[in-house]
């Protein structure tokens, strides 16, 4: 799913107000529900029909430093007798994320949004024949 | 997957420079990547032999306002025949991201993150047996 | 083996109660967690109420809210289901599971996902 694009509102003060000073806005120290609880099934890409690999990404400037994306390991899916079946489709479940640059020269450190495409598992599919008139 | 917690060395400046005022930092406008693209397979949610379907969420005080969450259709999977097989699971696949909350009193506006747990789409799994001994 | 065999089901007037148990073999609660669902003629599966023994929480479909509660003897590793104030529409075949998954914020089709086995099923036939 595609975040939409700001538009350049969203972090403006209302009309009346000074604008922001430099281009830069208070971005408040810690995160809301930080401890929120996950859970989701064990060992899923595994189990799936769609199964997946997943490849962690490390960037120490970036919040989250550790961003894991998924690969699917098949065309086809994964038939009841373990065999891929290529007559179905393993496709990738994409979704758009944002992340936190940090940026310092010296002791002048700043943040930055930046969105980030992130693969989060695999579904198996059916072919579909689309555009033939 | 989850996001790990901030730890609170990452939003902090080096050791050698004066700490940041009033536990806010600074954050730029404008997004990096704000035009990257989405190419996810069509119509995958109806497609999925563990179809979902889509709910919006709409928060004008976040960025995104617009947080789209996925819900499985079927505890079982969709069959060849179009079918549900019992013997198979829909499960949720789910991602923590990161949304931006807006506060505003007045003309002073500042902005915190915040962790959101989204259910991007569902996979088929084999039923596992696991803990018993 | 991981078994789960459910009972007390049969025919009930509306407005009238019956007890359902899922008895459980071969893992205990603290394994897994318990669901019942059910299966109306032409219908799919649907999710009735969960149970996790962990905390004690409990989740019921809206459909059922208010009328059906679902408790637990440990000691005989049996899960209980009692409907009360029965209507037509409940009629169907109830299934006991043993569910990986419990999350009622979840985006499944129902709070408990994930089956790792079903019971045989039992009838229950509300008539008008």
């Known amino acids: 799913r595609k975040i939409p694009k700001v538009g350049h509102t969203f972090f403006q003060k209302p009309e009346s107000c000074p604008p922001v000073p430099g281009g830069s806005m208070k971005l408040d120290i810690g995160i809301i529900n930080e401890n929120q609880r996950v859970s989701m099934s064990r060992n899923i890409e595994s189990r799936s029909t769609s199964p997946w690999n997943y490849t962690v990404t490390w960037d120490p400037n970036r919040y989250p430093s550790e961003v894991v994306q998924a690969q699917c390991r098949n065309l086809g899916c994964i038939n009841a007798q373990g065999k891929e079946d290529i007559s179905m489709n393993s496709v990738p479940i994409q979704q758009e994320t944002l992340v936190v640059r940090r940026k310092h020269q010296g002791c002048s450190v700043s943040f930055q949004l930046e969105k980030v495409l992130v693969t989060v598992g695999c579904t198996c599919v059916t072919p579909v024949i689309h555009h033939v008139q | 997957r989850k996001i790990p917690k901030v730890g609170h060395t990452f939003f902090q400046k080096p050791e050698s420079c004066p700490p940041v005022p009033g536990g806010s930092m600074k954050l730029d406008i404008g997004i990096i990547n704000e035009n990257q693209r989405v190419s996810m397979s069509r119509n995958i949610e109806s497609r999925s032999t563990s179809p979902w379907n889509y709910t919006v969420t709409w928060d004008p005080n976040r960025y995104p306002s617009e947080v789209v969450q996925a819900q499985c259709r079927n505890l079982g999977c969709i069959n060849a025949q179009g079918k549900e097989d019992i013997s198979m699971n829909s499960v949720p696949i789910q991602q923590e991201t990161l949304v931006v909350r807006r506060k505003h009193q007045g003309c002073s506006v500042s902005f915190q993150l915040e962790k959101v747990l989204v259910t991007v789409g569902c996979t088929c799994v084999t039923p596992v047996i696991h803990h018993v001994q | 083996e991981v078994q789960l065999v459910e009972s007390g089901g049969g025919l009930v007037q509306a407005g009238g109660s019956l007890r359902l148990s899922c008895a459980a073999s071969?893992?205990?609660?603290?394994?897994?967690?318990i669901g019942w669902f059910r299966q109306a003629p032409g219908k799919e599966r649907e999710g009735v109420s969960c149970f996790t023994s962990s905390d004690g929480r409990t989740f019921y479909a809206d459909s059922v809210k208010g009328r059906f509660t679902v408790s637990a003897d440990n000691a005989k590793n049996t899960v209980y289901l009692q409907m009360n104030s029965l209507e037509p529409e409940d009629t169907a075949v109830y299934f006991c599971?043993?569910?990986?998954?419990?999350?009622?914020?979840?985006?499944?089709?129902?709070?408990?996902?994930?089956?790792?086995?079903w019971g045989q099923g039992t009838q229950v036939t509300v008539s008008s």
């Open positions: 599971a043993a569910v990986n998954t419990f999350d009622e914020s979840a985006y499944a089709a129902f709070a408990c996902y994930d089956v790792v086995r």
């Open positions: 071969g893992f205990t609660f603290d394994d897994y967690d």
